[in-house]
């Protein structure tokens, strides 16, 4: 039961992380800057991975998608492949754990085939869920890295003066919501790998076993003591004890009265 | 890199009007705003008036009442219409515009070169 509902537990957990990534992946507001204050309006820029918006105070948005890959910043390309590598491999990862679930039952498929597909999806979950907090880490230090690099200064451009205006760079709510989403797909995959190993099926237990002989010259039979195999009568290990002593000859021999399972 | 190109300057009397305009061509992500600053001889850059591109308007309190500033997004433009205007607002007149040229990155302050206006008594 415990395993039942850790599995069922990490599949939803790894599913809110995996809706998370993809929002966080979609949202525009991975960055936040201030454009222009004024007494009348307030303009500010977010800008995500796939397009750049300007808003104003009045409720007036103006996007424009990054229809350019050669002009972007190597770090967002990277951020990009991170990002979607972490949808792909968590889309699968939720596919492959839909038919792991132990409350599902798909033909006659084995215990051990159920508890091998949910460390695949245990697995894939982690990696998917490293890769978005390794996404969204690396564009929080690139916003980072710009703010301080880009100190205020002036120069002569074409037909006029050029000013670079300070301004304050804030993380947007995807950063947040990524994070969020990459830490739950990553508590998600290692329920998930907790789980197989509740639902992998019980190797052989070759438990200790004290004889007591029953005379003073006794013989034990050779294999008298037999692993099970979870098949056959003997399911529960016990012994197979011979109280009795025995020439080397009589070993192999019919059980007697003595002989008892 | 953004280029602007104003135009519209000249002499003008007392009372009169003179619409003076600017285009912004280049490339960029974004014009955040544009607007007109102007220079008296030995005094400070002043705000004249600015528009967004949602055509929210600020003016100075000298040019409330007097000056139009206008917008054409789809080509980048933005126009000044001075009216009643007097010796104290000869100045030469500058083109602003505040965009954002790459991602990622602050936005930029581009100034034209500006364009004179002399009002006489």
């Known amino acids: 039961m415990a395993v039942t509902a850790c599995q069922g537990l990490g599949f939803v957990v790894s599913l809110i992380g995996i809706a998370g990534i993809i929002a966080a992946t979609c949202m525009d507001q991975w960055s936040t800057q201030d454009l222009y204050n004024n007494p009348v309006t307030a303009v500010f820029n977010y800008q995500g991975l796939w397009r750049s918006c300007v808003r104003e105070s009045s409720g007036f948005t103006e996007c424009r998608g990054y229809f350019t890959l050669l002009g972007l910043p190597a770090m967002l390309q990277a951020v990009r492949a991170l990002m979607i590598v972490g949808i792909v491999l968590g889309a699968i990862g939720l596919l492959v754990s839909i038919f792991a679930l132990k409350c599902i039952r798909i033909g006659s498929m084995e215990d051990s085939a159920k508890a091998n597909m949910t460390l695949t999806s245990g697995i894939m979950f982690i990696v998917s869920g490293l890769c978005a907090i390794a996404g969204v880490s690396v564009f929080a230090n690139m916003l980072v890295t710009n703010f301080w690099m880009s100190t205020a200064n002036m120069y002569t451009g074409m037909g006029g003066m050029v000013q670079t205006v300070q301004t304050r760079y804030t993380f947007g709510a995807a950063l947040f919501v990524g994070w969020v989403a990459g830490g739950l797909t990553l508590i998600g995959g290692v329920m998930m790998c907790i789980a197989c190993r509740g639902l992998a099926p019980e190797e052989t237990n070759y438990k200790a076993v004290s004889y007591h002989a029953s005379g003073h010259s006794v013989a034990y039979k050779p294999g008298g003591f037999k692993a099970s195999t979870g098949f056959g009568s003997n399911t529960k290990n016990k012994k197979i004890y011979d109280g009795g002593a025995r020439t080397e000859d009589e070993v192999q021999s019919y059980p007697s009265k003595h002989d008892y399972v | 890199q953004v280029k602007l190109e104003e135009s519209g300057g000249g002499l003008v009397q007392a009372g009169g009007s003179l619409r003076l305009s600017c285009v912004a061509s280049?490339?960029?992500?974004?014009?955040?705003?544009m607007g007109w600053y102007r220079q008296a001889p030995g005094k400070q850059r002043e705000l004249v008036a600015t528009?967004?591109?949602?055509?929210?308007?600020h003016y100075a309190d000298s040019t409330k009442g007097r000056f139009s500033i206008s917008s054409d997004n789809a080509k980048n433009a933005v126009a000044l219409q001075m009216n009643s205007l007097q010796p104290d607002d000869t100045a030469v007149y500058f083109c602003?515009?505040?965009?954002?040229?790459?991602?990622?990155?602050?936005?930029?302050?581009?100034w034209g070169q500006g364009t004179q206006v002399t009002v006489s008594s």
């Open positions: 602003n515009v505040r965009a954002l040229i790459k991602v990622f990155h602050p936005p930029n302050d581009y």
């Open positions: 528009i967004t591109r949602g055509g929210a308007t």
């Open positions: 280049g490339s960029f992500l974004h014009i955040a705003v």
